[in-house]
Every structure is written in structure tokens, then in C-alpha cells.
């Protein structure tokens, strides 16, 4: 039919932190570059109708969905969704294609479904139909890579079992330590799964989708390092494959390299051998130990020996679980207003954990990084000096563990007052809890200095925000003194704080602020 | 047999440097690690640092860090303690000790060298 | 850094004595300790490696036990030419430390 118009339907993604329900319109947000959805004319049926490829959303994306219509003349057009009918306004791109968009933004379940555009054009009519799903994420999984030797060759092959299927790479880096930082220039990403070059430094390899990044450094004994401050360990849960690398810089060929296991060799299949010359002339030698998948009786010293290096051990140990070992008692923590501080926690765990630090029910990325002797720490500095309960969370496939924080904020109480018919409320903030005394203010006492006891109750920490303690102090109504202004104050080691409240109105109590130091 | 045989005694200046060698005969100089003891008069023993002679690298006791530096020459199968900024604590007997490699964890020092004295005065 | 703690400072016991020192560290270090002989003006000597394997050429009435924390150096018959002080040295992690040193002396 010569008269239908050339259409074109695309999905664009956006990465947006707005909340809404669908708009029509172009709505400006950051975008994907747009994917396009085919829009093939459907057969047999009534009507020009036209189907975009179907649209796969996960929970909470932003979407746009958009055809652009290369026809003459002007275009009106309407969507339906679920039998609602909602607002269409075409405009004109430069190249005088009419553009007509839907905005979906923070997809929920109630957002799925058909989307129908008609279209009418001076020439023809014709509907535009987009199936919006949400993606079934439940069934996805990112598992840690793992490595295989490759049949017949000397290279190693990188497989991580995920849903969706992940993006693979391989990240190299020759130097040593902190210059081996992900986004080093230093460091070398080969996005693919197989890798031949395996006298690097440092290899890891890498496997992402859309739940995240996992990653395995191959594990490296260097006979030309100083040993580690202490044993090098390495955990793995039965039916793993281990492997580890030992390597060593001589300068000729004149050194062969052993592996042992308890001061047994290790048999043969269980290790290969590969050598280069170095740009210097000397040589590099690398052993592999590998175990395609490991038992209980695989646990031990695994030593690599040289006939011209020291040698070099680690410490296999093979568990049926995954653990995360580390002291959950809870940590209460008292610093100044200004006091550099950070929440750390010491850990040990197999397979690496993935942690959050929660605050006031807000999270927070977590980082953790490896210490020498086999534990790890994450630390936790972004608390902007605010006290109240601070929680470290981590959790791996088999395991999982809380520490509990409380920060408490030196400084000097800050007093808010509150009145009724009966009686008159003051509430507190400041650390160390503060202590009460109310005053009455009269003829005899204008400077406010006799003391009032009794009727008055104190509670400690009657109101717990996120474990932000409250003190308050309650002064029960006496004729004694009904009429006249009281003043509460707060007292800790850092200063004094006061409120001044007249008894006897009976509307709004006016209060006045009294801070002294 | 297994030896190390260490440079003279030495009388430095405080804030001076002293370098002190080790040559090493009888086995694979670059199969073993070598560390640096020293013991003050009438003192125990203390650890300044470990060097890998098949590579050259090197691992610092903390309070040393700064002042020690360890090297190795392979072709004479020696190493050398440089130690700076001399002050009277430093007088004291200065070992090289083979690290053993028998062990899981190449901290044990198997064969000794006689000791070197460095005396710091004014 | 690992604390190395022995006992007794000093010692004094006759020929055919049967001797014992013991060790402490600061934390668990498996079964990493040494333990060194010194005679006054030479190099220390080693003894025993990881607790309790004698080194080359040491007499048989040289002996060591312990793991974890506590350790022992046992000498089952005190000859003339043991009388010296003797170390222990944990191996298990960086820096390797000694302890303060027993001094055997004949009584």
C-alpha cells in the first residue's frame, strides 16, 4: 500500500530519579542512546496495524516509547491504555517527522501492558500497538567467575553461570599494589573469555549483567616478592575449582618451579607449566596448581618451590559453607562535634560479602577492603556527625551478619518547651544526657533562681530517634505557681540551656530561648 | 658448608650512616631470604627487616622504616643493611640470618652471620 | 605486632638438671615458634623450628612442644655447654619477634 507512511518505533531508556505515572509528551531526562522496536505491519488483521517488538522493563525504570512518522500533512493521534484514554500531543522533529511520545517513568506492575496509538494522518489511519512487561528478575543470578584450563592450549577460560548472560572480561594489571586500582591506567580490560597472556601481575576476571559486577583474582604466590605479612589463605566450598599461580623472575632459564601439597607433590594433571622471556632477557616461569573440583582432603599447605627462589606457601582450606566470621556486639561511640571518625568493621568471609551501611532507614554503599593477613574491613565515614543508630549489614550465599553502631554527639543540650492547662514539658538533645532544674520567676527571684522541686518528673530517654536519646522534664501545675513564668534548664558537661514559659495563657505559651554557656 | 661471613666493626657519629655487609657461600644465594637481627649490649634480640634476594624485595620492621635499606647483589652473593640518621640507641651487634624455608611461614633464621659491631658515640 | 613473653627471666640449675622454659604469645599463632640458643659474644643458634622439629645436629635431649599460645622448650639433662640464654620467636606473621630471653645459669 503506497499510501501507509514510513514509521519508525523506538524505546528509549532513562536513567532518572523522578516519580510518576505515564506522560505524553517529550519529558527531559538523561538518556540511553534509543533502541529500536521494528514496528512491523501485523498480518490479518482489521485495520493498519502496526507491532512494536515487545518491551522488557525492570522494576522502577524510566521509559519513553516513540514513533516517528515520516508522512505529509499534519497527524493527530490518541493512546489507550487499559480502555483509558490519554492526552497525545505530536510535534515535529527537524527532519518534519512527526514525533508523538509516552513517558512511563518509575515503571510499576500497573504500568504494564498494551499501549495502542491511533494515528491519523491526512492520507490514512492506522494504530501502533507496544507491549510493556516488567522483566522477571527473580529468575536472575550473578554468580562469581570461576576458571577452567582450556582444552589442549595453554590458556585459562573465564565462565560465570548467570541469567542474563554476562558480559566477561578479563582485568590485567603488571604493577604492583595501589596503582592495580580498577580505573588505573595501569590496569587492562580484555572483554573476552578466553586469555593466553597469564604472566601479568595481577589477573582478575570479571562477569557483569543487569544485577551487578563479580569478580575472582586468579590467587599469585611471587617467589620474587617478600612473603606476606602473614600466610596468604585462600577459602573455597566443596565442588569448587581451585587454582593458584605461582611465579617466578629468574635471570636464565636455569630454575624449575615444584609444587607440594603437606610435602607431597602434586600429581600430575594437577599442574602445567608455562615460560616466557622477559623484555630484560630474563625468564618467567609460571606453575599453575589446579583442582577442577575440590574435596575436603584438598585443605592444606600448598608450597611452591624453586631451585633458585625461596619458597612460598599458602593455606588451602576447603568448607562445606559459605561464613562470614567477625564480632557482632554492638559498639557505642561518643566523639566531639568536629572529631574525624569512621565505623570499621574487621571481618573474615567466604564468598565476598556484599554489605550496606543503614542509617535512619537510608543505605548506604558500602566498600570493603582486603587487609594482609586474610580479614577485610569496611568502613563507614559519611555519618555527617549525626547521632543515632548506626547498622553494618553483609551477607553472601550462605551467610549473613548485623553489627549494630550507636554514635552519640558531644555537645551542649539545646531546649524545646511545650504547655498545657496541667502542666509544662521540656525536651532536650544534647550528650551526655542532661540533667533538669526549673526556676520560678518572681518579685522576690527576677533573676529566675528559685528553685522549683516539686512536681516535677524527669524522664531519661523517653523518645529514641534512629537511637537518638531524648531527655525531657515535666513540671505538674500548682497553685503556687500558676501566673507566673518558670524556666526550665538543661545542663551537661559542654553548657546550659534554658526556656523560659509563662503558666497562666491560655492559648499559645510563648517561650523564650535562654542559651548559657 | 652454609656461611655467611659479615663486614668489620664500625664507630659512627650520631647522624650518620652505616652500611654493613653479608656474603653468603656453601648454597643457592637467591633460594633463601635474608634477615637483619640486632641486639643492643646486654639486650634481647630485635627484627629490622627481611630482603628477598631472588628478587630484591623488601619488607621493614616499622620502627626502621625510613632509616633501613636492604640490597642485594647477586653476582658476589651479598647483602647490605644501610642504616641512617645514627643515634646512640642504634649501638648494638647487627646479624644476618638466613631465613629458613623448611617452614610454612620463611620467618626462622636457620644459619647466622658472627655479628657486625656499630658503635654510635660523639 | 605480636607480643612473645617468657619465663623465667633467669634460671639457674645444675648438670643432669631436666630444664623446662615456656613461651607465651600475645595471640593464637598456630604451631610457628622457634626457639634459639645464644652463648655470650656469638651469633644466636637455632634450635627447634615450628615448636617442635629439632634442626640439624641439635642433641636429642632438646625438645619442644606447644601450640596456639603456649609453648615449652624442654631440656631433659642439662650438659656444661647448654648453660646460655635461650629465645623463642614467633614466625607466624610480620615482624617476626622474640621474647625477652631466659638466662640458664649453673647453680
Known amino acids: 500500500n503506497q499510501d501507509l507512511p514510513v514509521i519508525k518505533c523506538v524505546l528509549i531508556n532513562h536513567k532518572n530519579n523522578d516519580s510518576s505515572v505515564g506522560k505524553s509528551s517529550s519529558y527531559p531526562m538523561v538518556s540511553e542512546s534509543p533502541e529500536d522496536l521494528g514496528c512491523a505491519l501485523r498480518p490479518q488483521s482489521s485495520g493498519t496495524v502496526y507491532e512494536a517488538a515487545a518491551v522488557e522493563v525492570d522494576v522502577s525504570a524510566s521509559i519513553t516509547l516513540q514513533v516517528l512518522v515520516d508522512a505529509p500533512g499534519n497527524i493527530s493521534c490518541l493512546w489507550v491504555f487499559k480502555h483509558s484514554s490519554l492526552n497525545c500531543q505530536p510535534h515535529f522533529d527537524l527532519q518534519n517527522r512527526g514525533v508523538v511520545s509516552m513517558v512511563i517513568l518509575k515503571m510499576t506492575e500497573t504500568q504494564a501492558g498494551e499501549y495502542l496509538l491511533f494515528i491519523q494522518s491526512e492520507a490514512t489511519n492506522y494504530t501502533i500497538l507496544f507491549t510493556v512487561s516488567i522483566r522477571n528478575t527473580l529468575l536472575y543470578t550473578l554468580r562469581r567467575p570461576y576458571f577452567r584450563k582450556m582444552e589442549n592450549q595453554d590458556a585459562l577460560v573465564c565462565i560465570s553461570e548467570s541469567v542474563p548472560e554476562p558480559i566477561v572480561e578479563w582485568v590485567l594489571c603488571d604493577s604492583q599494589g595501589e596503582s592495580c586500582k580498577e580505573e588505573s591506567p595501569a590496569v587492562v580490560k580484555k572483554e573476552e573469555k578466553v586469555l593466553h597472556e597469564l604472566f601479568g601481575t595481577d589477573i582478575r576476571c570479571c562477569a557483569r549483567n543487569e544485577l551487578g559486577r563479580e569478580c575472582t583474582r586468579l590467587f599469585t604466590i611471587d617467589l620474587n616478592q617478600t612473603p606476606q605479612t602473614t600466610l596468604p589463605q585462600l577459602f573455597l566450598k566443596v565442588g569448587e575449582p581451585l587454582w593458584i599461580r605461582c611465579k617466578a623472575v629468574h635471570v636464565n632459564h636455569g630454575f624449575g618451579l615444584t609444587w607440594e601439597l603437606e610435602n607431597k607433590a602434586l600429581e600430575e594433571g594437577n599442574y602445567f607449566e608455562m615460560s616466557t622471556y622477559s623484555t630484560n632477557r630474563t625468564m618467567i616461569r609460571i606453575l599453575f596448581a589446579f583442582v577442577s573440583s575440590v574435596a575436603r582432603n584438598d585443605t592444606g599447605y600448598y608450597t611452591c618451590s624453586s631451585s633458585k627462589h625461596p619458597s612460598q606457601s599458602a593455606l588451602v582450606t576447603i568448607v562445606e559453607k559459605g561464613f562470614i566470621n567477625a564480632t557482632n556486639s554492638s559498639e557505642d561511640y561518643e566523639i566531639d562535634q568536629y572529631e574525624e571518625f569512621c565505623f570499621s568493621v574487621r571481618f573474615k568471609a567466604y564468598p565476598q560479602i556484599r554489605c550496606t551501611w543503614t542509617f535512619s532507614r537510608k543505605s548506604f554503599p558500602c566498600e570493603q577492603k582486603g587487609l594482609d593477613n586474610g580479614y577485610s574491613i569496611s568502613k563507614f565515614c559519611n555519618h555527617k556527625h549525626q547521632p543515632g543508630e548506626y547498622i553494618f549489614h553483609a551477607e553472601n550465599d550462605d551467610a549473613q551478619f548485623t553489627k549494630m553502631f550507636t554514635l552519640n554527639i558531644r555537645r551542649k543540650p539545646q531546649v524545646l518547651a511545650e504547655a498545657s492547662a496541667s502542666q509544662a514539658s521540656c525536651f532536650s538533645d544534647g550528650y551526655p544526657l542532661p540533667s533538669w532544674t526549673w526556676k520560678k520567676c518572681s518579685d522576690k527571684s527576677p533573676n529566675c533562681t528559685e528553685e522549683i522541686t516539686e512536681g516535677v518528673w524527669n524522664r531519661k530517654a523517653n523518645r529514641k530517634v534512629f537511637g537518638q536519646w531524648v531527655s525531657s522534664s515535666t513540671l505538674n501545675m500548682s497553685e503556687a505557681i500558676k501566673g507566673f513564668l518558670v524556666k526550665c534548664c538543661a545542663y551537661n558537661s559542654l553548657g546550659t540551656s534554658c526556656e523560659t514559659i509563662l503558666l497562666n495563657s491560655p492559648g499559645p505559651f510563648p517561650f523564650i530561648q535562654d542559651n548559657i554557656s | 658448608q652454609v656461611q655467611l661471613v659479615q663486614s668489620g666493626a664500625e664507630v659512627k657519629k650520631p647522624g650518620a650512616s652505616v652500611k654493613v655487609s653479608c656474603k653468603a657461600s656453601?648454597?643457592?644465594?637467591?633460594?633463601?631470604?635474608m634477615h637483619w637481627v640486632r641486639q643492643a649490649p646486654g639486650q634481647g634480640l630485635e627484627w629490622m627487616g627481611i630482603?628477598?634476594?631472588?628478587?630484591?624485595?623488601?619488607s621493614y620492621a616499622q620502627k626502621f622504616q625510613g632509616r633501613v635499606t636492604m640490597t642485594r647483589d647477586t653476582s658476589t652473593s651479598t647483602v647490605y643493611m644501610e642504616l641512617s640518621s645514627l643515634r646512640s640507641e642504634d649501638t648494638a651487634v647487627y646479624y644476618c640470618?638466613?631465613?629458613?624455608?623448611?617452614?610454612?611461614?620463611?620467618?626462622?633464621?636457620?644459619?647466622w652471620g658472627q655479628g657486625t659491631t656499630v658503635t654510635v658515640s660523639s | 605486632d605480636i607480643q612473645m613473653t617468657q619465663s623465667p627471666s633467669s634460671l639457674s640449675a645444675s648438670v643432669g638438671d631436666r630444664v623446662t622454659i615456656t613461651c607465651q604469645a600475645s595471640?593464637?599463632?598456630?604451631?610457628?615458634l622457634n626457639w634459639y640458643q645464644q652463648k655470650p659474644g656469638k651469633a644466636p643458634k637455632l634450635l627447634i623450628y615450628?615448636?617442635?622439629n629439632k634442626d640439624t645436629g641439635v642433641p636429642s635431649r632438646f625438645s619442644g612442644s606447644g601450640s596456639g599460645t603456649d609453648f615449652t622448650l624442654t631440656i631433659s639433662s642439662l650438659q656444661p655447654e647448654d648453660f646460655a640464654t635461650y629465645y623463642c620467636?614467633?614466625?607466624?606473621?610480620?615482624?617476626?619477634?622474640f621474647g625477652q630471653g631466659t638466662k640458664l645459669e649453673i647453680k
Open positions: 595471640q593464637d599463632i598456630s604451631n610457628y
Open positions: 656453601g648454597y643457592t644465594f637467591t633460594r633463601y631470604y
Open positions: 620467636q614467633q614466625s607466624y606473621s610480620t615482624p617476626p619477634t
Open positions: 640470618a638466613r631465613g629458613e624455608t623448611r617452614s610454612y611461614a620463611p620467618y626462622g633464621m636457620d644459619v
Open positions: 615450628q615448636a617442635s
Open positions: 630482603i628477598n634476594p631472588s628478587g630484591g624485595s623488601t
